[in-house]
């Protein structure tokens, strides 16, 4: 049952070479194991709310309580970590908001670049200056939570110094981490202060602690590893984009749609239009026109630029993205002001995210 009548046909088909699509991450809720977590579904005017975890329906059980717009998880465990979504079903439409839950002691994150030669991490001390262990490069330790696809290689680093030169050992979930604890073992590169695990599997999930010590003291740092088994998902659009805009007659304006998709997406910019003086077809559905779509002759499909706008250009602009898995769309409004009024970026946005995973 199509929800609109297209003035120009649309298909699933992406026609242009891919670019690198990326978005900001969904909101993350962190809880320590054993804690209770309560999340409110941030959607308005919901007649019925349904919840999913990792794309699968979530129902109440002895630890999961669903009351109205609230999801409560009692006595959280690492298994509760994942991508959650609440969908608000209304009489005329539905909307989805998604968020991450991480049940872990770790709370910060950063980048995870490869070692070069690692020489900067191996600090030699003047033999007279006795010193307890200390971290030499905390920037490389900021990313505590590592969510890694299965089969990837993981590297945890604890660059340290001290005099005498400290030793490093690793714990998994608070206990000595032995080679036989995982198939294929692991590598410790002492001069890089690193632990390397190749081809990670779900059983590698857990807390990894480096303990760096010498006769003058001991310091430690814990990383949390989550091994993610994923299925391909439909496009996700960055919340808040495209954003409402206003300009004067004759002005220029740009709408931006930021896309994440792990299958090549097809992007369309669509606007409500009139046909034969009517905004709606005989079936009662609105007429829509495809203004731009990703294709061979279309550069940077994530941006819709309008030049020398007229009052007729005012209205709702829809960014619709599809891949072979599914679709997502969000919209924004363009207000065209008379020449004497100064334009301004509108504060409120009416973008309504439509994504699941």
């Amino acid at each position: 049952r199509p929800s609109f009548s297209l003035v120009e046909d649309t298909t699933l088909e992406p026609e242009e070479p891919p670019t690198k699509y990326q978005i900001s991450q969904p909101e993350v809720y962190v809880a320590a194991p054993g804690e209770s977590l309560e999340v409110r579904c941030l959607l308005k005017d919901a007649a019925v709310i349904s919840w999913t975890k990792d794309g699968v329906h979530l129902g109440p059980n002895n630890r999961t309580v669903l009351i109205g717009e609230y999801l409560q998880i009692k006595g959280a465990t690492p298994r509760d970590s994942g991508l959650y979504a609440c969908t608000a079903s209304r009489t005329v439409d539905s909307e989805t908001w998604y968020f991450m839950v991480n049940v872990t002691d770790a709370i910060s994150s950063g980048d995870d670049e490869d070692d070069t030669d690692g020489a900067e991490d191996f600090v030699s001390e003047n033999s007279n200056n006795k010193r307890a262990p200390y971290w030499t490069n905390t920037e490389k330790m900021e990313k505590r939570l590592h969510a890694v696809p299965a089969a990837n290689t993981v590297k945890f680093r604890c660059p340290a110094g001290g005099n005498p030169m400290p030793t490093m050992r690793w714990l998994k979930n608070g206990k000595e981490f032995k080679q036989e604890h995982r198939i294929g073992g692991y590598k410790v590169r002492n001069q890089h202060w690193s632990l390397i695990m190749e081809s990670v599997v779900p059983s590698d999930k857990g807390n990894y602690t480096c303990v760096v010590e010498n006769e003058y003291g001991s310091i430690n740092h814990t990383y949390h590893l989550d091994v993610v088994e994923r299925s391909p998902h439909r496009p996700i659009l960055q919340a808040g984009l495209p954003a409402n805009a206003s300009t004067v007659v004759g002005g220029d304006v740009e709408f931006v749609c930021k896309v994440y998709s792990d299958a090549q997406p097809h992007i369309q910019w669509i606007k409500h239009v009139e046909k034969n003086g009517s905004k709606y077809g005989p079936d009662g559905l609105p007429y829509l026109k495809v203004l731009k779509h990703s294709g061979i002759n279309s550069s940077n499909a994530e941006v819709l630029a309008l030049f020398n706008v007229t009052e007729a250009d005012a209205g709702e602009y829809i960014c619709k993205v599809s891949n072979y898995i599914g679709q997502a769309n969000q919209s924004a409004w363009l207000t065209v002001l008379p020449k004497q009024q100064a334009p301004g970026r509108e504060k409120e946005i009416t973008a309504s995210p439509d994504y699941l995973e």
Epitope: R1, P2, S3, F4, T10, T11, L12, E13, P14, E15, P17, P18, S50, T52, G55, V56, H57, A85, T87, S94, T96, S231, P232, R234, D262, A263, Q264, S322, Y324, I325, G326, Q327, L356
Partner: antibody, heavy 113, light 107 residues
Framework: QVQLVQSGAEVKKPGASVKVSCKAS????????IHWVKQAPGQGLEWMGA????????SYNQRFKVRATLTADTSTSTVYMELSSLRSEDTAVYYC??????WGQGTTVTVSS | DIQMTQSPSSLSASVGDRVTITCGAS??????LNWYQQKPGKAPKLLIY???NLADGVPSRFSGSGSGTDYTLTISSLQPEDVATYYC?????????FGGGTKVEIK
């Protein structure tokens, strides 16, 4: 868990139509394309088309566009594939699949006079 | 339409062998390629998506590689339960064409 359950086997005469159903459960039905794939006896796989239940958007393989019709009923989380003007070469197993990740068990359609 | 050419059409190997199946596309598909395993009388099962990503629940002995027009599915150590027909599929553009299939048997 995600499940796609298809309707049972059909035997049809040439020129008739057949309507195969695919009932989805365990996920938000409207959020994924449902694809249909044909597999003739002893042959490979052939994509027929897809439908997006949320808005009814469809896309067809040109080879099937004239005779195949895909529809979705969001109230029952069911997708239908109707094939008209049947001929003997339509004898095949027809699969529905949620974004090619989860597949139905297949429906055998036999066209014979 | 994008044509997908698989080779070999069939192969026989011993348990523990490394098995390689190749798939060629008639034009650049930018890594938009899936691999499936189909056992007799059963529906296809997704093994690899996006040319290199292992689907949920698939043993790590399966791996995918390639880019542009040339792609490979590798089974690092063939197991008896891997006897099946394997298909590649273009998921860049419609129609989402499949390769002709590779039948894998145990010697």
């Amino acid at each position: 868990q995600v499940q796609l359950v298809q309707s049972g086997a059909e035997v049809k005469k040439p020129g008739a139509s057949v309507k195969v159903s695919c009932k989805a459960s365990g996920y938000i039905f409207r959020n994924y394309y449902i694809h249909w794939v044909k597999q003739a006896p002893g042959q490979g796989l052939e994509w027929m088309g897809a439908i997006y239940p949320d808005n009814g958007d469809t896309s067809y393989n040109q080879r099937f566009k004239v005779r195949a019709t895909l529809t979705a009923d969001t109230s029952t989380s069911t997708v239908y594939m109707e094939l008209s003007s049947l001929r003997s070469e339509d004898t095949a197993v027809y699969y529905c699949a949620r974004a090619f990740t989860y597949w139905g068990q297949g429906t055998t359609v036999t066209v014979s006079s | 339409d994008i044509q997908m050419t698989q080779s070999p059409s069939s192969l026989s190997a011993s348990v523990g062998d490394r098995v390689t199946i190749t798939c060629g596309a008639s034009e650049n598909i930018y890594g938009a390629l899936n691999w499936y395993q189909q056992k007799p009388g059963k529906a296809p099962k997704l093994l690899i998506y996006g040319a290199t990503n292992l689907a949920d629940g698939v043993p790590s002995r399966f791996s995918g590689s390639g880019s542009g027009t040339d792609y490979t599915l590798t089974i690092s150590s063939l197991q008896p339960e891997d006897v099946a027909t394997y298909y590649c599929q273009n998921v860049l553009s419609t129609p989402y064409t499949f390769g002709g299939g590779t039948k894998v048997e145990i010697k």
